[in-house]
Interface confidence: low
């Protein structure tokens, strides 16, 4: 007959590493007689035999956790007792391990060149996974621009075109590796002009082709502007290759002009624009260009539309960067600043300002502006707007109009050519061509010229308000 023997644990418990949702088993081999009663504890709390999460077999010597959870981490002990001697205990730890899991994978990104891109890659795992990135088929190397952040995110500073491509993040620990799906980084590039149109000096009536090449991602669109307005004539041909757009504008040249190529592309809700300009001048006109810095073109503005003759060619001064816009702005500014004047003065002042700022000129001759005839200027000053002029001059003497008066688009009558000397050398104001008898009150002002110089002047239906301050300096 066997002698009673106190329990001895022959295989002490060891630390067990287990993956979530997998099986973990502790072995507690005991030698004793009689057979011991074996109980198990987790963190010093008894594991109940009927707990369905556990399986206890081999007379209690085998404890199996059927599906490991995060919360199963802890210290497990087996206690063996058979009534002979004391109870014996052996303990071991369960370390719940977790393969890497990417909880916030990267997503497709569109980014503008030069900005900063961040591709997220948030991971879980135990041990904590290390994160690396792959671009295309190669491991991505960090540098001063490209860094893998502590969070696992990939940061690309000052994004370049060559950063575009497919990326994935890789999370790795001792238990395994997780890969994100491939994501695309698209780099958008602001529109940029590669080849600007060239300036030309051609003969009247010849054809010219202006060429403009631009690049961008997405491919830009190109539009053409002539002297500040959309091109009204000419044909445009475009071709696109490798994100480069080539636009050719063919023109029939009847007047000089400033042609601007505008390349535009869209980035989300925003647009980027690049511009380049070229001038087309007419050869025969260039000899006298030193004297007349400008060109003849139809008036396409609004303010003076009712005053200037239909389809008349007027002079645009190229000392302004954008002559047509600049001159229109001048007249606009004058109008906006004008205060109410008498109905007699208003149309006369309007005619004077418009014809002075947009002086007549004709193609085929040197583009020299044709000033207003002196007599018409004096008529406005001394007849139609006498009161206003007088009031304004009084204020000017008292220092009320000192600043900016010289900038206003008003002629100095005494410096203008007389129509009596050369009727073709100056412009008449048709609005004022009527019998001065129609004017009921004639102001008693000593004219700087004999009254014979003041022409017969007509009534006018035009109605623009012109203040003394602006109209008659």
């Amino acid at each position: 007959e066997k002698l009673p023997k106190a329990p001895v644990i022959t295989t002490p418990l060891e630390t067990v590493d287990a993956l979530v949702e997998e099986v973990a088993t502790f072995m507690c081999a005991v030698e004793s007689y009689p057979q011991p009663e074996i109980s198990w504890t987790r963190n010093k709390i008894l594991i109940k035999l009927f707990d369905t999460r556990y399986s206890i077999r081999e007379n209690g010597q085998l404890l199996t956790i059927l599906s490991v959870e995060d919360s199963d981490d802890g210290i497990y002990c087996c206690i063996a007792n058979n009534g002979v001697g004391g109870a014996v205990e052996s303990c071991g730890a369960l370390q719940v391990k977790m393969k890497p899991k990417i909880t916030r994978p990267p997503i497709n990104v569109k980014i503008i060149e030069g900005l900063k891109a961040v591709l997220p890659c948030t991971t879980m795992g135990n041990p904590k996974p290390s994160v690396s990135w792959i671009k295309g088929d190669n491991a991505l190397r960090e540098n001063s621009r490209i860094a893998v952040l502590e969070s696992g995110s990939l940061r690309i500073h000052n994004v370049q075109k060559e950063d575009a491509g497919q990326y994935r993040c890789v999370a790795k620990n001792s238990l395994g590796t997780a890969y994100s799906k491939l994501v695309k980084l698209e780099v958008e590039v602001f529109a940029r002009i590669l080849r600007a149109p060239e300036s030309h000096n051609v003969t009247f009536g010849s054809f010219v082709t202006l060429r403009c090449t631009a690049i961008g991602i997405p491919v830009p669109t190109i539009s053409w502007i002539e002297n500040g307005n959309a091109v009204s004539s000419g044909s445009i041909q475009e071709s696109v290759k490798d994100r480069v757009i080539d636009s050719r504008l063919q023109l029939f040249i009847t007047k000089p002009g400033l042609y601007t190529c505008i390349a535009t592309n869209k980035h989300g809700e925003k647009f980027s624009t690049a511009k380049a300009a070229a001038t087309v001048s007419i050869a025969e006109w260039s000899k006298s260009q030193k004297d007349s810095q400008g060109y003849c073109a139809q008036y396409r503005g609004e303010v003076c539309d009712a005053v200037l003759a239909k389809d008349a060619l007027v002079f645009f001064n190229t000392s302004y960067r954008d002559p047509e816009d600049a001159q229109e702005l001048l007249i606009h500014t004058a109008w906006n600043e004008l205060k109410a004047v008498s109905p007699l003065c208003r149309p006369a002042a309007e005619a004077l300002l418009c014809n002075h700022l947009f002086q007549e000129c004709s193609p085929g001759v040197v583009p020299t502006p044709m000033p207003i005839c002196r007599e018409y200027c004096l008529a406005v000053k001394e007849l139609f707007c006498a009161k206003e002029w007088q009031a304004m001059e009084g204020k000017a003497h008292r220092g009320l109009y000192r600043s900016g008066m010289h900038l206003l688009p008003v002629p100095e009558c005494s410096k203008l050519p007389s129509m009596h000397r050369d009727p073709t050398a100056c412009t008449r104001l048709p609005y004022l061509d009527y019998k001065k008898e129609n004017i009921t009150t004639f102001p008693s002002i000593t004219s700087s010229r004999p009254s014979a110089d003041i022409p017969n002047l007509p009534a006018s239906t035009s109605s623009f308000a012109v203040s003394p301050a602006y109209s008659m300096t």
Epitope: T103, T122, K128, L149, E150, S151, R155
Partner: antibody, heavy 118, light 108 residues
Framework: QVHLVQSGAEVKKPGASVKVSCKAS????????MHWVRQAPGQGLEWMGW????????SYAQKFQGRVTMTRDTSISTAYMELSRLISDDTAVYYC???????????WGQGTMVTVSS | SYVLTQPPSVSVAPGQTARITCGGN??????VHWYQQKPGQAPVLVVY???DRPSGIPERFSGSNSGNTATLTISRVEAGDEADYYC???????????FGTGTKVTVL
């Protein structure tokens, strides 16, 4: 539900030590660093250091080197921050905080007020 | 050590936009996080990794980061946005975390 629950307020004398606990629940405690941040009355936030609950590795802010000890007990998912040789300037609210997968702290304890007064 | 500078206070009328800056040497190369803290409460993360929002944070909160300045923008400000706001970065060289000096946002 993810939670960090801290121990209650403490009043300590200068020169003494204080040990603040932070119990985590609702996530894998060993998977994420635990940080400690303090805030003196009317002042800003001040990072003290972190502990990696899995390995027990730590990193302390220069200012607290030699005075702070961060430990953890993975069996009860609890992190501890012990600050020794207390002075009155250590009077502050001490927070534990963790970043679940990001380098920002997206989960914070409710804070523990530690008062150092003679 | 790395220093983050914030304006002490920003005042804004309800419905307007508040902008809080966080200055640091070459901060554009780091991940910036922003926290909101109301009196007597623990901080709450409102923006992380420069411009990402945790779930539950309104779209009115947005962030940007480049050069030497990161910015937290709160559009259509509400009375409930009145709080202290802190920026924070991880300093790779020291493996330390740094908080900004804090900005008190007052809704007028």
């Amino acid at each position: 539900q993810v939670h960090l629950v801290q121990s209650g307020a403490e009043v300590k004398k200068p020169g003494a030590s204080v040990k603040v606990s932070c119990k985590a629940s609702g996530y894998t405690f060993t998977g994420y660093y635990m940080h400690w941040v303090r805030q003196a009355p009317g002042q800003g936030l001040e990072w003290m250091g972190w502990i990696n609950p899995y390995s027990g590795g730590t990193s302390y802010a220069q200012k607290f080197q030699g005075r702070v000890t961060m430990t953890r007990d993975t069996s009860i998912s609890t992190a501890y921050m012990e600050l020794s040789r207390l002075i009155s300037d250590d009077t502050a609210v001490y927070y534990c905080a963790s970043g679940l997968g990001i380098s920002a702290f997206d989960i914070w304890g409710q804070g523990t007020m530690v008062t150092v007064s003679s | 050590s790395y220093v983050l500078t914030q304006p002490p206070s920003v005042s804004v009328a309800p419905g307007q936009t508040a902008r809080i800056t966080c200055g640091g040497n070459n901060i554009g190369s780091k991940s910036v996080h922003w926290y909101q803290q109301k009196p007597g409460q623990a901080p709450v993360l409102v923006v992380y990794d420069d411009s990402d929002r945790p779930s539950g944070i309104p779209e009115r909160f947005s962030g940007s980061n480049s050069g030497n300045t990161a910015t937290l923008t709160i559009s259509r400000v509400e009375a409930g946005d009145e709080a202290d706001y802190y920026c924070q970065v991880w300093d790779r060289s020291s493996d330390h975390y740094v908080f900004g000096t804090g900005t008190k946002v007052t809704v007028l």
